[in-house]
């Protein structure tokens, strides 16, 4: 059977006026997954995102991540899109005060 990913979006200061947003998917099986940043619901070009390999996380499941840089104040325009085993979800960037955003998908 399949195990849905836990999706976690974080943000960190990049340079003045910009922030780096990172979307991590973990504890999923099988390893095939789509994880990408969308701007206004449209996927960013591959060369404007940084990608992590899909790696085993030690429990027979897998983990990966994707990151991009955005303008501070434009967080609402960006979502992390995840597709796994026929299910999909979108995950917003947390507001400045909150640095973690966890979702488990079934």
């Amino acid at each position: 059977g399949s195990v849905p990913p836990m999706v976690n979006v974080t943000r960190s200061e990049a340079s003045e006026g910009n922030i780096t947003v990172t979307c991590r998917a973990s504890s999923f099986y099988p390893r095939n997954i789509t994880l990408t940043w969308r701007q206004d619901g449209v996927s960013l070009s591959h060369d404007t995102q940084q990608w992590g390999d899909v790696l085993p996380d030690g429990n027979g499941t897998y983990q990966t991540w994707v990151a991009t840089r955005i303008c501070q104040g434009e967080e609402q325009r960006f979502t992390c899109y995840m597709e796994h085993s026929g299910n999909h979800s979108t995950h917003p960037v947390p507001s400045g005060n909150s640095h973690h955003h966890h979702h488990h998908h079934h």
Epitope: D40, V42, S45, T90
Partner: antibody, heavy 118, light 112 residues
Framework: EIQLQQSGPELVKPGASVKVSCTAS????????IYWVKQSHGKSLEWIGY????????ISNQKFTGRATLTVDKSSSTAYLHLNSLTSEDSAVYYC???????????WGAGTTVTVSS | DILMTQTPLSLPVSLGDQASISCRSS???????????LEWYLQKPGQSPKLLIY???NRFSGVPDRFSGSGSGTDFTLKISRVEAEDLGVYYC?????????FGSGTKVEIK
């Protein structure tokens, strides 16, 4: 086949409101945003805003803030554009559109003509 | 708001001619992460617009290879290598790098 079916033409009085619908078919509705675009007669195109059907989140052109409300009904795969306090300036064709993987308006509805007249 | 200025407003052509439309943005539309959301649309009378080019230079599915897009920063160009009758209509450039998204005023390609 991916389609966006829009509601029919509307003739409304100044000061009234109107609700234009856009029903999606041929794909999973919550996978893609729905955009709304205005085209006044013989004029260029104007972006109104968009809604993410998965989260219900919206981003709008400030020019339309307070006058245009975007909503969705996931159960019927339908997006709505609600315009209030209409004036003759709002007489236009209103389009809904859907993005694709890397592009913004890959699929368009046929447009809904709204005429504001007393 | 970012102003998208298209030139010319009207472009009379003979079938088989090359046509070139310019679109200039009032500021750079390269986003912080390097993404440039610049698209071209063609609208024929009584029809919805149709997507031709996305992310500056990528042809949309089913668009003939006589259409090409180029440019960067603030200056963008759509070229039609050999105009055919089905290419007549109004062409719009569109930027979605910054909110509010904005369209150019349109270029009408018509028979000379």
């Amino acid at each position: 086949e991916i389609q966006l079916q829009q509601s029919g033409p509307e003739l409304v009085k100044p000061g009234a409101s109107v609700k234009v619908s856009c029903t999606a078919s041929g794909y999973a509705f919550t996978k893609y945003n729905i955009y709304w675009v205005k085209q006044s007669h013989g004029k260029s195109l104007e972006w109104i805003g968009y809604i993410d059907p998965y989260t219900g989140g919206t981003i709008s052109n400030q020019k339309f803030t307070g006058r245009a409300t975007l909503t969705v009904d996931k159960s019927s795969s339908t997006a709505y554009l609600h315009l209030n306090s209409l004036t003759s300036e709002d007489s236009a064709v209103y389009y809904c559109a859907r993005p694709g993987s890397y592009w913004y308006f890959g699929v368009w509805g046929a447009g809904t003509t709204v005429t504001v007249s007393s | 708001d970012i102003l998208m200025t298209q030139t010319p407003l009207s472009l009379p052509v003979s079938l088989g001619d090359q046509a070139s439309i310019s679109c200039r943005s009032s500021q750079s539309i390269v986003y912080t992460n390097g993404n440039t959301n610049l698209e071209w649309y063609l609208q024929k009378p009584g029809q919805s617009p149709k997507l031709l080019i996305y992310k500056v230079s990528n042809r949309f599915s089913g668009v003939p290879d006589r259409f090409s897009g180029s440019g960067s920063g603030t200056d963008f160009t759509l070229k039609i290598s050999r105009v055919e009758a089905e290419d007549l209509g109004v062409y719009y450039c569109f930027q979605a790098s910054y909110v509010p998204f904005t369209f150019g005023s349109g270029t009408k390609v018509e028979i000379k």
